[in-house]
């Protein structure tokens, strides 16, 4: 039987909580890596690709060594919400052109959503301040051409890959300090 009614829940082990978040992040990072390889193989595009609506790379938010857990989780959640929105937009806007990347894009979207829910849970379990609901973001304009959509796909997956690497490195580093 569980604890008697009214007794406080056992406080979670922060290292274990953080660890399971890292594992989900690494899984998503590997999915993103594989999808990026596929995209480069099927739709080669040289050079850096940017999309103004994507979040600024989190790594510019300060040196990893100086970051604290609340700021990493808050920033990561905000950025991943933006990437989720961009992946959804990509699938809607480019469905037919990128059909060779389905079901992988769908899986990526599902796992991104799962990681976001995991981050929300972690923040509440660690009693970190909850973010206010996100204001509705302006709709993303459809790509001007198929090529524009492919370049957007490169930018979205490339940015997500780097963001997840930043997250894995930051979270594992923070775990060593707990």
């Amino acid at each position: 039987p569980g604890p008697p009614p009214g007794s406080p829940r056992a406080s979670p082990d922060p290292r274990a909580e953080l660890d399971s978040t890292v594992l989900l992040t690494r899984s998503l990072l590997e999915d993103t890596r594989q999808l990026t390889i596929q995209l480069k193989d099927k739709f080669p595009a040289d050079g850096d690709h940017n999309l103004d609506s994507l979040p600024t790379l989190a790594m510019s938010a300060g040196a990893l060594g100086a970051l604290q857990l609340p700021s990493v989780l808050t920033r990561l959640r905000a950025d991943l919400l933006s990437y989720l929105r961009h992946v959804q937009w990509l699938r809607r806007a480019m469905g037919s052109s990128l059909k060779t990347l389905e079901p992988e894009l769908g899986t990526l979207q599902t796992r991104l959503d799962r990681l976001l829910r995991r981050l929300q849970l972690l923040m509440s379990r660690l009693a970190l301040p909850q973010l206010p609901p996100d204001p509705p973001a302006p709709p993303l304009a459809p790509p001007s051409s198929t090529w524009g959509g492919i370049r957007a796909a490169h930018a979205i997956l490339g940015g997500l890959h780097l963001t997840l690497d930043w997250a894995v490195r930051g979270l594992l580093l923070l775990k060593t300090r707990l």
Partner: antibody, heavy 119, light 111 residues
Framework: EVQLVQSGAEVKKPGASVKISCKAS????????MDWVKQAPGQRLEWIGD????????IYNQKFTGRATLTVDKSASTAYMELSSLRSEDTAVYYC????????????WGQGTTVTVSS | DIVLTQSPASLALSPGERATLSCRAS??????????IHWYQQKPGQAPRLLIY???NLDSGVPARFSGSGSGTDFTLTISSLEEEDFATYYC?????????FGQGTKLEIK
């Protein structure tokens, strides 16, 4: 051809600093992390730390925090490792290695730079 | 830190024989479908060379006679039929947590 080319051997006195360079070519420098590994005679390989060339600063093995400094020059596709307050135990071969994002496995290595610390 | 212990410390075999090298971790390095163990080969005076990543994935250009297996705390590198150029020192490495650490190595020698 993907390669990492490191600077030449160094002989230093105890207390001095050394800065090793690692020039990357044949791939997009910012697509991978750059890691540094120490191999002292008769000892295990030891991970010193890594840096993502996109920014955000390096992370270090606690054993090297405060003495190792990792930097990159993105425009020159070159990574650097500086080790300060050298002591005899720092005598080793130091390698730069290309690290897969988020996974810390190293698929391309520099040829190694021998650092000898001796008075 | 996670400690990796390799066995045997040295192994003497003949070309054509099968080599089995072991790596044991002080705690599990596997989780949610991934095992964070990697294998390298190093010859005297050379840098290490990645052979296997994430326990069982062959790096590009590595001959198919090399294979990796295992999960949890116990991992194996197998060389199905030894060639002259395979005689070297082999290291396992984990990347489950920070810092990544390496085993002490297994030296494979010609009998």
């Amino acid at each position: 051809e993907v390669q990492l080319v490191q600077s030449g051997a160094e002989v230093k006195k105890p207390g001095a600093s050394v800065k090793i360079s690692c020039k990357a070519s044949g791939y997009t420098f910012t697509d991978y992390n750059m890691d540094w590994v120490k191999q002292a005679p008769g000892q295990r390989l030891e991970w010193i730390g890594d840096i993502n060339p996109h920014g955000g600063g390096p992370i270090y093995n606690q054993k090297f925090t405060g003495r190792a400094t990792l930097t990159v020059d993105k425009s020159a596709s070159t990574a650097y490792m500086e080790l300060s307050s050298l002591r005899s135990e720092d005598t080793a071969v130091y390698y730069c290695a290309r690290g897969e994002l988020g996974h810390w496995y190293f698929d391309v290595w520099g040829q190694g730079t021998t650092v000898t610390v001796s008075s | 830190d996670i400690v990796l212990t390799q066995s045997p410390a040295s192994l003497a075999l003949s070309p054509g024989e099968r080599a089995t090298l072991s790596c044991r971790a002080s705690k599990s390095v596997s989780t949610s479908g991934y095992s964070y163990i990697h294998w390298y080969q190093q010859k005297p005076g050379q840098a290490p060379r990645l052979l296997i990543y994430l326990a069982s994935n062959l790096d590009s250009g590595v001959p198919a006679r090399f294979s990796g297996s295992g999960s949890g705390t116990d991992f194996t590198l197998t060389i199905s039929s030894l060639e002259e150029e395979d005689f070297a020192t082999y290291y396992c490495q984990h990347s489950r947590d920070l810092p990544p650490t390496f085993g002490q190595g297994t030296k494979l020698e010609i009998k």
